[in-house]
């Protein structure tokens, strides 16, 4: 997260860290007791490493009674996701067991109504991604509030040049932005999950390159079918 600040400890109990060989790789969001939603491209970076999901964390390194590391029983990338595109960049991870729910571990309701979020709406994005262009990684969860950007502006030739489909949304990126390591994390508007940070190698913090988020409402049928 660029231009953000440390999040309030355990105030985002849906937040997950998708880890490979014990290292944070991507963000994720608990959407059901045994399921975490993340970005499909995160798995590409996992190679043959052991993928696990950390729930209930604020600090990645410090002991916290709420922290639990879960093995992954099944990884289900969206069937249409491809390495060379950010389309359909969603991944569902089934935990080895149901998560123990409590104050610091709770699923987040996700948007099922397939309607664009009003441009200008302030949404919250959180993660353990880099906090500087130098690549500094935070130990504690960071967050930032970002205004939603209309698709037409986002698709300008000077911005993303038509790459933003109806199944994506954008948020402003003027110094405040999601960045490397935040991919797969939640974009939350009005207490509801609206988007998932895409995992392209986009430049961060440049207002001409807005943040791109996969709209979960557009994938409601797929999410429901996997969770069923």
């Amino acid at each position: 997260i660029l231009g953000g600040r440390e999040a309030e400890a355990h105030a985002r109990p849906y937040m997950a860290s998708v880890q490979v060989n014990g290292e944070h790789l991507c963000g994720g969001v608990l959407v059901a007791e045994q399921w975490v939603l993340s970005a499909a491209h995160c798995l590409e970076d996992a190679a043959d490493g052991k993928v696990q999901v950390l729930l209930g964390a604020h600090s990645l390194s410090q002991p916290e009674p709420s922290k639990r590391l879960y093995d992954v029983l099944r990884a289900v990338p969206h069937p249409d996701s491809r390495p060379d595109t950010i389309d359909h960049d969603l991944l569902l991870l089934q935990l080895s067991e149901k998560a123990t729910l409590g104050p610091a571990v709770r699923p987040l309701p996700w948007q099922r109504v397939d309607r664009d979020v009003e441009p200008g709406t302030l949404c919250d994005v959180a993660g353990w991604g880099i906090v500087s262009h130098a690549g500094r990684r935070p130990d504690r969860l960071q967050h930032v509030l970002l205004p939603v950007l209309d698709r037409a502006t986002c698709n300008r030739r000077t911005h993303h040049d038509g790459a933003i489909t109806q199944r994506m949304m954008c948020a402003e990126s003027n110094r405040r932005d999601s960045c490397k390591g935040d991919s797969g994390g939640p974009l939350v508007c009005g207490g509801v999950l609206e988007g998932v940070v895409t995992s392209g190698s986009r430049v961060c913090g440049n207002r001409k390159k807005p943040g791109i988020y996969t709209r979960v409402a557009s994938y409601a049928a797929w999410i429901d079918s996997v969770l069923a």
């Epitope: 985002r12 916290e64 610091a104």
Partner: antibody, heavy 117, light 107 residues
Framework: EVKLVESGGGLVQPGGSLKLSCAAS????????MSWVRQTPEKRLEWVAY????????YYPDTVKGQFTISRDNAKNTLYLQMSSLKSEDTAIYYC??????????WGQGTSVTVSS | DIQMTQSPSSLSASLGGKVTITCKAS??????IAWYQHKPGKGPRLLIH???TLQPGIPSRFSGSGSGRDYSFSISNLEPEDIATYYC?????????FGGGTKLEIK
């Protein structure tokens, strides 16, 4: 010196409501998670509500979910517990408590709530 | 929900003696247990957290140990001011469950 002082307890009829307050001093209130815990007449301690330091998340055990509401005003260094649809089983001494190292490290002296007709 | 079974519910001991209280969790609580002293008209006082870490200002006569599901708390060299009810608290997963309490009396 850390100080937590509860108030607002009293006698209330079944089905009634009550709002408890806890005034905090001697520490930076906005830096701490806070909880309410009650002690029943049988001397059992029961955790009833939790709120993060900025008020961004709350939590209630099933026993009081939908009945109790915890809130805080960090500008006033005060924690609250709104209790509604009170039953005789809610008769207890109610304590506010501060969290540190995730345990409950400082408690107030308690305020007594009696639910009776 | 994890249950905490504390025993004994009451005990009597001599000044200068030693007492031990146990708490058994219904499943592993990863050492996230605290111990409290509670006197009438006051709020409980934290003595120990994370199984064995003594709070500042608490004398070393108080100690705690355990792991997994089984935990114990001891007071040695009993003094008159130790008369109180003692409770264990499980806070694993930030879900807080107390033991039933042990009332300590001096013979």
């Amino acid at each position: 010196e850390v100080k937590l002082v509860e108030s607002g307890g009293g006698l209330v009829q079944p089905g009634g409501s009550l709002k408890l307050s806890c005034a905090a001093s001697g520490f930076t209130f906005s830096n701490y998670i806070m909880s309410w815990v009650r002690q029943t007449p049988e001397k059992r301690l029961e955790w009833v509500a939790y709120i993060t330091n900025g008020g961004g998340a709350t939590y209630y055990p099933d026993t009081v979910k939908g009945q109790f509401t915890i809130s805080r005003d960090n500008a006033k260094n005060t924690l609250y517990l709104q209790m509604s649809s009170l039953k005789s089983e809610d008769t207890a001494i109610y304590y506010c408590a501060r969290h540190d190292f995730y345990a409950l490290d400082f408690w107030g002296q308690g305020t007594s709530v009696t639910v009776s007709s | 929900d994890i249950q905490m079974t504390q025993s004994p519910s009451s005990l009597s001991a001599s000044l200068g003696g030693k007492v031990t209280i146990t708490c058994k969790a219904s499943q592993d609580i990863n050492k996230y247990i605290a111990w409290y002293q509670h006197k009438p008209g006051k709020g409980p006082r934290l003595l120990i957290h994370y199984t064995s870490t003594l709070q500042p200002g608490i004398p070393s006569r108080f100690s705690g140990s355990g792991s997994g599901r089984d935990y114990s708390f001891s007071i040695s060299n009993l003094e008159p001011e130790d008369i109180a009810t003692y409770y264990c608290l499980k806070y694993d997963n930030l879900l807080y469950t107390f033991g039933g309490g042990t009332k300590l009396e001096i013979k």
